[in-house]
Interface confidence: low
């Protein structure tokens, strides 16, 4: 004989000894009908705010307040947004590994430093976890007796540098 609790809709609860479908009380929900109890709705407070309010059939969904991001399944905790020099992983904010950087606040991933030598340029300023390498001008390969004319700004009377 089919128990009438089996016919209960989501948003209700039902006890086997009194098989009547009853609506979930306020601040509770039941996504599956026929359960003996409704579940207490999640409250989004503190560093959480409501993404979706609770209904009789669905739990509330939380998200993190400005400047924080979710961690864990169903946003079980809030962690401060990553700062430059870090990237967000499943384990939270992690410092960029050597040779990589992230110059963005709260978002982005660690990217490899620019390889200046691929463009035939020298490293003018070394990179950090927050900043990319600064490449210098292209490296000029001098042949003997090359003359470079250096003209200071604001005047034509230049200097000659003889490279032997």
């Amino acid at each position: 004989v089919q128990n009438s609790c089996d016919n209960c809709q989501p948003g209700t609860f039902c006890r086997k000894y009194n098989p009547v479908c009853k609506s979930c009380p306020p601040s509770t929900f039941s996504s599956i009908g026929g359960q003996p109890n409704c579940n207490i709705c999640r409250v989004c407070a503190g560093y959480f705010r409501f993404k979706k309010f609770c209904s009789s059939t669905h739990n509330a969904e939380c998200e993190c307040i400005e400047g924080f991001h979710c961690l864990g399944p169903q946003c079980t905790r809030c962690e401060k947004d990553c700062r430059p020099g870090q990237e967000l992983t499943k384990q939270g904010c992690k410092t960029c590994s050597l040779g990589t950087f992230n110059d963005q606040n709260g978002t982005g991933v660690c990217r490899p430093w620019t390889n200046c030598s691929l463009d035939g340029r020298s490293v003018l300023k070394t990179g950090t976890t927050e900043k990319d390498v600064v490449c210098g001008p292209p490296v000029v390969s001098f042949s003997p007796s090359t003359t470079i004319s250096v003209t200071p700004e604001g005047g034509p009377g230049g200097h000659s540098l003889q490279v032997l």
Epitope: Y47, T76, K80, R83
Partner: antibody, heavy 117, light 107 residues
Framework: EVQLVESGGGLVQPGRSMKLSCAAS????????MAWVCQAPKRGLEWVAT????????YYRDSVKGRFTFSRDNAKSTLYLQMDSLRSEDTATYYC??????????WGQGVMVTVSS | DIRMTQSPVSLSTSLGETVNIECLAS??????LAWYQQKPGKSPQLLIY???TLQNGVPSRFSGSGSGTQYSLKINSLQSEDVATYFC?????????FGAGTKLELK
């Protein structure tokens, strides 16, 4: 209302052990990292340890590493600080605290631990 | 460890005055700074987190500012209930560290 109530303090001899407890109520305990902070007159406030919301990760200050063990029972909304090989410099008031944005947004009333022979 | 140097150590002032307490970090803490108030025989209470965000229920006469290594707590129009010791705390990196405190008294 968020409440944190510590217990288990008292007088203990150097080298012996003591276990502190902290009962939490008024918030969803398993959503929050928790911490112990101590305060001694000459040293001021010192962070002791932090435990992640699910108990999977713990962090300790160097001076207690290997001697103190921080654990939690989310079903009971309770924290524990097992303190072994106690030293005179561990004498302090110990507070359990809820971790907010790295800060400690709620504190218990504190429990005194005196390590002396 | 990041050292937090708080100044002044103590401060004697009058009701209605404006109070400034400074906190200097030994390295950049990227605004990960909190301020606490502690009254005698009581546990500390969070006033401000993330440099300038007021904790719920904290009067608006309290404000925080700063960046990099330098931070400050300002109390406008001092009230008698503000007499306490104030601590700064960095939570940028473990181990989290506190300043030694500033004891605020009335003249």
């Amino acid at each position: 209302e968020v409440q944190l109530v510590e217990s288990g303090g008292g007088l203990v001899q150097p080298g012996r052990s003591m276990k502190l407890s902290c009962a939490a109520s008024g918030f969803t305990f398993n959503n929050y990292d928790m911490a112990w902070v101590c305060q001694a007159p000459k040293r001021g406030l010192e962070w002791v340890a932090t435990i992640s919301y699910d108990g999977s990760t713990t962090y300790y200050r160097d001076s207690v590493k290997g001697r103190f063990t921080f654990s939690r029972d989310n079903a009971k909304s309770t924290l524990y600080l097992q303190m072994d090989s106690l030293r005179s410099e561990d004498t302090a008031t110990y507070y359990c605290a809820r971790v907010g944005a790295g800060d400690f947004d709620y504190w218990g009333q504190g429990v005194m631990v005196t390590v002396s022979s | 460890d990041i050292r937090m140097t708080q100044s002044p150590v103590s401060l004697s002032t009058s009701l209605g005055e404006t109070v400034n307490i400074e906190c200097l970090a030994s390295e950049d803490i990227y605004s990960d700074l909190a301020w606490y108030q502690q009254k005698p025989g009581k546990s500390p209470q969070l006033l401000i987190y993330s440099t300038n965000t007021l904790q719920n229920g904290v009067p608006s006469r309290f404000s925080g500012s700063g960046s990099g290594t330098q931070y400050s707590l300002k109390i406008n129009s001092l009230q008698s209930e503000d007499v306490a010791t104030y601590f700064c705390q960095q939570n940028n990196n473990y181990p989290y560290t506190f300043g030694a405190g500033t004891k605020l008294e009335l003249k």
